[in-house]
Structures are given as C-alpha cells and as structure tokens.
C-alpha cells in the first residue's frame, strides 16, 4: 500500500483491480443511453476531469524515483470519478438498468482507491467543478462523455501498475 | 439582482449571420447551464440551445444544429448564440434563459431575458 | 421527440372561475415537467416546476398535478392578472419541448 514514508502499494493487486476497471469501463460504456454525438460540444470537457500528464511522475523514471507523486494524481483521479459515479449523474433519471456494470465500475473506483490510501493518510482530493446537479436531458450526454474520459484514466493507471508489478515489485 | 440582458439582434437577409449576446449579472455565472429559447411571432415557445457551465457540452435543437453555435465566456459573464445560414423560419423573438428548476438545487432559478427580436427577410 | 400537447388551446373564463389546462406527454417524463405564464410582450414566467411545485413569489391559486405522461395545471379562483398564455415543458430529454399553448382569455 501507498503510505506516507515511500512504502510501495501492493502492485500485483492494484494492476489486477485496475485491468478490471479497464474492462468494466469499456462495458459500461454503450450501455449508459443512446448517444446522438452530434450533441457534443466542439471542446471536450478537459478543465473537467483529471488527467495523468507528464509532470505528474507517473513515467518508468518518475515512478523508480518515487511513486507517490503518481500514485497520488492516480488517487485523487479515482476519488474523483468515485464521486462522479455515486452522483445524480448517473443515479438519477433516466434510469440505469439493474444490471448495468455502472455499480461494480463505482465499487471498483472506491476498491482501489482504498488499496493506494489506508485509513488514517488523507491525500488531497480534487474538488468536482460544477458537474452536479443535473437535469435528465443532460445526463446522458454526461454519462457518456465521463465515461470516455473514465476509460482513458483508467488505461493510463493499468499501465502504471503493469509498470509497477514487473518491475517495482519487492 | 439577478438579471440576463440579451442584445446583437436585427434585421438580416437569408443565408447571413448575426451573434447574439446575453450579459448576465446577479449570480455566479460559471456555476450554471444557460440556454436560448425562441418564439416566432404569434406562435409558441421553441428550445433551441443550452450549454454545460464550463461551456465544454452543448445541446441543439435539429432545427439550428450546425447553423447556430452556442458558447460562453465565463470571465465575461456572457452567452452567445452565433447564428449562420439564416432562414425566414428563424425570425423570432430569442431569449437568454437561466433555469435551474428539477436539478436538486435548493436554489430554484428560473430567469429570462427581454428577448432580442431576429428578423430574417429579404 | 417527446411531444407535449395542451389542451384545450383556449379557453374562455370569468374571473373567480376554476380553470384546468391539461398536458399529454408523447412518452413517461416522470415528473419532469414545468408550467409557464406569458403575457403578450413578455418572457415567460415560471408557475410551477417538478410537475407539482410551485415557485416561489407564485400565488398559492396555481397548482400543479400529474406523472408519467398526464399533467394538470389548475388556476383555482381565476383573478384578473392571470388572462394570458400557459405553456408546459418537459425537460426529461432532448430537445426540451413545450406545448403548443392554451390561451386564457376573459368571457
């Protein structure tokens, strides 16, 4: 698990969750509404979501010199769309079918945030700019369009851990 | 005061283009969806747009979509609606709406503007 | 498309009169539907919203009823200021649709 003091996670369970994730992501995807993507606005909303970038350590070099950094920007990302995920959003109308992989993709989020923060160390979560409340005439375009950038957060922190369980391993 | 003052209408022929604006003042502008309803001259009530608080989701009537383009400039407190390839069928009263009814806010905003008055006419 | 369709498309009322203005839906919106008053050369003003709430600052005489597909706007004891258009609007999905309009207008 990742603690304060540079303890490394548990990398083998973290790449396991997260190609999880990266499953249930991509399944939950089509199945969040029909989408008209004429509807979509000519700028993607990425002031909205977090994103794994270059500075944030999260490259073979920045990860052998001190994972946390990553670790962290990976954490507050899952926090972030967690939160997304339990929201009006995708909670309120219309509604989801019973069965949709939505729930298990939220339980997941939570899952392996829990695993990169144990209780007692709080890291800084980022703050969810003005994506709630909503109306049921803009949920399914925000479902989908969170959902897309879901996919892609959790690709980049699959590779981290893949990253991490060969290499950084004890 | 909560207040929306549209502006940028007039008298255009078919096929030219006009920008709408709507200033807004009262509220927190980059907190909340806005939208442009219209209403042509002795007829009902028309959606024709809304737009996300960041400005990066926008909805369109089939009416206007890729005609019309709505935006926002959050530092200006101000919506646009671009207007390109106008018809006679798009003369109407418009207004800058802010409505946030139905969406779990405490707060029940529901604002217009005056409307501005778009003529398409050769 | 969900169509909203109002009726009647006018009616004629005195004042003190009980007025009821239906709303069909052309699919389930749940409650999702609002209740507008224009008055001619004037934007819209919102009654009720949430099918059944009413507005703050909206006289208690106006009220709101109905889910799923069937709605009632009903003015309880109609009073001068209230002859105008009504409009109601479903924002479950896009595009955001209103009825086509009943006009209230004095007997």
């Known amino acids: 698990r990742a603690v304060p003091g540079g303890s490394s996670p548990a990398w083998t369970q973290c790449q396991q969750l997260s190609q999880k994730l990266c499953t249930l992501a991509w399944s939950a995807h089509p199945l969040v509404g029909h989408m008209d993507l004429r509807e979509e606005g000519d700028e993607e909303t990425t002031n909205d979501v977090p994103h794994i970038q270059c500075g944030d350590g999260c490259d073979p070099q920045g990860l052998r010199d001190n994972s946390q950094f990553c670790l962290q920007r990976i954490h507050q990302g899952l926090i972030f769309y967690e939160k997304l995920l339990g929201s009006d959003i995708f909670t309120g109308e219309p509604s989801l079918l019973p069965d949709s992989p939505v729930g298990q993709l939220h339980a997941s989020l939570l899952g392996l945030s829990q695993l990169l923060q144990p209780e007692g160390h709080h890291w800084e979560t980022q703050q969810i700019p003005s994506l709630s409340p909503s109306q049921p005439w803009q949920r399914l375009l925000l479902r989908f369009k969170i959902l897309r950038s879901l996919q892609a957060f959790v690709a980049v922190a699959a590779r981290v851990f893949a990253h991490g369980a060969a290499t950084l391993s004890p | 005061e909560v207040q929306l003052l549209e502006s940028g209408g007039g008298l255009v022929q078919p096929g030219g283009s006009l920008r709408l604006s709507c200033a807004a003042s009262?509220?927190?502008?980059?907190?909340?969806?806005m939208e442009w309803v219209r209403q042509a001259p002795g007829k009902g009530l028309e959606w024709v747009s809304s737009i996300w608080p960041s400005g990066g989701l926008t909805w369109y009537a089939d009416s206007v979509k890729g005609r019309f383009t709505i935006s926002r400039d959050n530092s200006k407190n101000t919506l646009y609606l671009q207007m390109n390839s106008l018809r006679a069928e798009d003369t109407a009263m418009y207004y800058c709406a802010l409505r946030t009814w139905g969406s779990g806010n405490n707060d029940v905003f529901d604002i217009w503007g005056q409307g501005t008055m778009v003529t398409v006419s050769s | 498309d969900i169509q909203m369709t109002q009726s009647p498309s006018s009616v004629s009322a005195s004042v003190g009169d009980r007025v009821t203005i239906t709303c069909r839906a052309s699919?389930?919106?749940?409650?999702?539907l609002a209740w507008y008053q224009q008055k001619p050369g004037k934007a819209p003003k919102l009654l009720i919203y949430?099918?059944?709430s009413l507005q703050s600052g909206v006289p208690s005489r106006f009220s709101g009823s109905g889910s799923g597909t069937d709605f009632t706007l009903t003015i309880s004891s109609l009073q001068p200021e209230d002859f105008a258009t009504y409009y109601c609007q479903q924002s479950y999905s896009t595009p955001l649709t209103f009825g086509g309009g009943t006009r209230v207008e004095i007997k």
């Open positions: 009262g509220f927190t502008f980059s907190k909340y969806s």
């Open positions: 949430a099918a059944s």
């Open positions: 699919q389930g919106i749940s409650s999702w």
